[in-house]
């Protein structure tokens, strides 16, 4: 098992978290991806992409939007209107099967504090465990998609065993696979 060091992302309430999860194209371009939050030692899948298609559509679950760009080997995650209670540990994973998922990269430790909203200030980026002071510029995000249709995801599973090639880690007890509305 490879131990992954978490990255700390510090935001203010009302801000938007935008994350870039990159993956190996040759391995995972056609796989489903998911965004999960660790609750204790239990990962909770908050949203996951549809089955691969030629034209992938964004998936929106409440304040979370996922968009997979398989040509580019990138998953885009947006969490809008952050709240203090959103604080916690998050991960992008490759969702290949309820009993096998792969963590894509270092977990994100999201810290949301009360205060005026803005975007994180830009400075030399660091690799791990660095706090950033947000600037005062607000990140405006309007509603992105309309005309929802609902896709029922796989039923809940009690455990997920994560294999560990490269920078991936073992997880257990992944729960709460949820119904995901998909927006065209």
């Amino acid at each position: 098992t490879t131990e992954l060091t978490e990255e700390k992302y510090e935001y203010k309430e009302g801000q938007t978290l935008e994350v870039k999860c990159d993956y190996a194209l040759e391995k995972y371009a056609n796989s489903r991806k998911a965004w999960q939050k660790m609750e204790g030692k239990m990962p909770k899948i908050l949203a996951k992409t549809e089955r691969p298609s030629e034209n992938s559509h964004p998936v929106q679950v409440g304040r979370i939007t996922l968009e997979d760009y398989p040509d580019h080997g990138l998953l885009q995650v947006r969490m809008t209107n952050l709240q203090v209670e959103d604080s916690g540990l998050y991960q992008c994973v490759i969702y290949q099967h309820p009993k096998e998922s792969h963590v894509l990269f270092n977990p994100i430790c999201l810290v949301v504090t009360k205060g005026s909203s803005g975007t994180p200030g830009s400075s030399e980026n660091s690799t791990q465990n660095v706090y950033r002071t947000p600037s005062t510029t607000a990140k405006a995000l309007g509603p992105r998609y309309t005309s929802p249709r609902t896709v029922t995801q796989a039923p809940p599973e009690s455990t997920v065993v994560v294999s560990t090639p490269g920078s991936e880690i073992n997880l257990t007890n992944v729960t709460d696979i949820i119904r995901v509305p998909v927006f065209n």
Partner: antibody, heavy 124, light 107 residues
């Protein structure tokens, strides 16, 4: 000094391949994605794709898929962009550019550091 | 792909004039927009990031604004050293795309 130093100009025949290098110095090479952008004479800027120097993951614009390969050698802090099956319309200045982000995994695509460009001329 | 329509393609103004360049995206890009300056024979230089943030070391006469699909870049008082081509670049959606450029000259 923080900089990206690119290899020199190249003249190639149609159908050939070219490999442009981009050597980083003054910062931790593996902490920033490297992107490649090209500019044909008298034309605008065109993004070709990106590479994560840490893991070697890459992503290419559809237009270039199958012809472009982005690689790196972390021991010498150098990124490479190889373009094959060259045609006359590939004649351009090719830039490598560093993607700055507040956090390593932020969805931010600010190119705050650029190489000086490598002119690739494709002519029979 | 998100198309970026930049206008005008060229302009000529006097020193001290206020210069405005616009960029319109074919879809919402959520303020995910940068502005670059390119001088002949030199690499592009980042001026404004995320629609309105001034890059460190860039003179305050440069500014950016906008939201949704419409964005504006302004030089409040044109200087001779500002003669260059300016490009917008969106990153709200992939692939990243640039505007066609605006060549700024001094009368």
């Amino acid at each position: 000094q923080v900089q990206l130093v690119q290899s020199g100009a190249e003249v190639k025949k149609p159908g050939a391949s070219v490999k442009v290098s981009c050597k980083a110095s003054g910062y931790t090479f593996t902490s920033y994605d490297i992107n490649w952008v090209r500019q044909a004479t008298g034309q605008g800027l065109e993004w070709m794709g990106w590479m994560n120097p840490n893991r070697g993951n890459t992503g290419y614009v559809k237009k270039f898929q199958g012809r472009v390969t982005m690689t790196r050698n972390t021991s010498i802090s150098t990124a490479y962009m190889e373009l094959s099956s060259l045609r006359s319309e590939d004649t351009a200045v090719y830039y490598c550019a560093r993607r700055r982000a507040v956090y390593r995994s932020s969805w931010e695509w600010y190119f705050d550091l650029w190489g000086r460009g490598t002119l690739v001329t494709v002519s029979s | 792909d998100t198309q970026m329509t930049q206008s005008p393609s060229s302009l000529s103004a006097s020193e001290g004039d206020r210069v405005t360049i616009t960029c319109q995206a074919s879809q919402d890009i959520f303020n995910d927009l940068n502005w670059y300056q390119e001088k002949p024979g030199k690499a592009p230089k980042l001026l404004i990031y995320h629609a309105s943030n001034l890059e460190t070391g860039v003179p305050s006469r440069f500014s950016g604004s906008g939201s949704g699909t419409d964005y504006t870049f302004t030089i409040s008082s044109l200087q001779p050293e500002d003669i260059a081509t300016y490009y917008c670049q969106q990153y709200g959606n992939l692939p990243l795309t640039f505007g066609g450029g605006t060549k700024v000259e001094i009368k």
